[in-house]
Interface confidence: medium
């Protein structure tokens, strides 16, 4: 027969055939052969596999440091990776939560809606057309652009959510 | 590098005054908000102040509104905390911190004890 040129779901192609991939929580030790299946071995304690593989080495745990302000959330098991969260009261840096800080900021672009209390984070949000941040900042809402018409200016430059708006004088030459 | 160093702790009788300082160096001081953080006797950190980079804003926690003034000098790339009217719960090892509060950046902080 023919050699495949592709597998079954949770196979892989090796040396012109197809073998198992081995199960979450177990590394490949040994690819299959014509008359033997592939051999897979379970992750050591400290370890995970969370994908059908054919891994050679499990992944590491990820380890929640105390000296970052981290704690596990949920232990790792053989097919899943440890869950970081951050000590009470302090908040994580990013989804992934590889750091702590005591109240986020809000991003250029961005005001705080609510300032962090000891229980949440802080919240930001966008600023909407007619409204700027230009800094980073745990606290500032975002500022509406300038009025250059209440300072009988024109507006020279527009503004973003970034950035204000840049006023100037009025042209005089008018016919 | 980033340095941060508190000074102007001390015993302080309640209902008396103190003035914190905190010399910075290492980043440029005017693009960044600064604030106080606090810690108590076996608590945890308590965000007390903030002031933006322009210095005309200025945060402050409940606990300490209209006792406390958090204040910046550009010229000496300092920060401030006025403190009156001081009480027993207000002792605690004072702190400085640029922007993003990181849990694993502290200086050593300045220690307010307010006891009779």
């Known amino acids: 027969p023919e050699p495949p040129t592709a597998c079954r779901e949770k196979q892989y192609l090796i040396n012109s055939q197809c073998c198992s991939l081995c199960q979450p929580g177990q590394k490949l030790v040994s690819d299959c052969t014509e008359f033997t299946e592939t051999e897979c071995l379970p992750c050591g304690e400290s370890e995970f596999l969370d994908t059908w593989n054919r891994e050679t080495h499990c992944h590491q745990h990820k380890y929640c440091d105390p000296n970052l302000g981290l704690r596990v959330q949920q232990k790792g098991t053989s097919e899943t990776d440890t869950i970081c969260t951050c000590e009470e009261g302090w908040h994580c840096t990013s989804e992934a939560c590889e750091s702590c800080v005591l109240h986020r900021s809000c991003s250029p672009g961005f005001g705080v809606k609510q300032i962090a209390t000891g229980v949440s984070d802080t919240i930001c949000e966008p600023c909407p057309v007619g409204f700027f941040s230009n800094v980073s900042s745990a606290f500032e809402k975002c500022h509406p652009w300038t009025s250059c018409e209440t300072k009988d200016l024109v507006v020279q430059q527009a503004g973003t959510n970034k950035t204000d708006v840049v006023c100037g004088p009025q042209d005089r030459l008018r016919a | 590098e980033v340095q941060l160093l508190e000074s102007g702790g001390g015993l302080v009788q309640p209902g008396g005054s103190l003035r914190l300082s905190c010399a910075a160096s290492?980043?440029?001081?005017?693009?960044?908000?600064m604030q106080w953080v606090r810690r108590a006797p076996g608590k945890g950190l308590e965000w007390v102040s903030a002031?933006?980079?322009?210095?005309?804003?200025?945060y402050y926690a409940d606990s300490v509104k209209g006792r406390f003034t958090i204040s910046r000098d550009w010229s000496k790339n300092t920060l401030y905390l006025q403190m009156n009217s001081l009480r027993a719960e207000d002792t605690a090892v004072y702190y400085c911190a640029k922007e993003l509060l990181y849990f694993d950046y502290w200086g050593r902080g300045t220690l307010v004890t307010v006891s009779s």
């Open positions: 290492g980043f440029t001081f005017g693009w960044y908000e």
């Open positions: 002031i933006s980079g322009d210095g005309y804003r200025t």
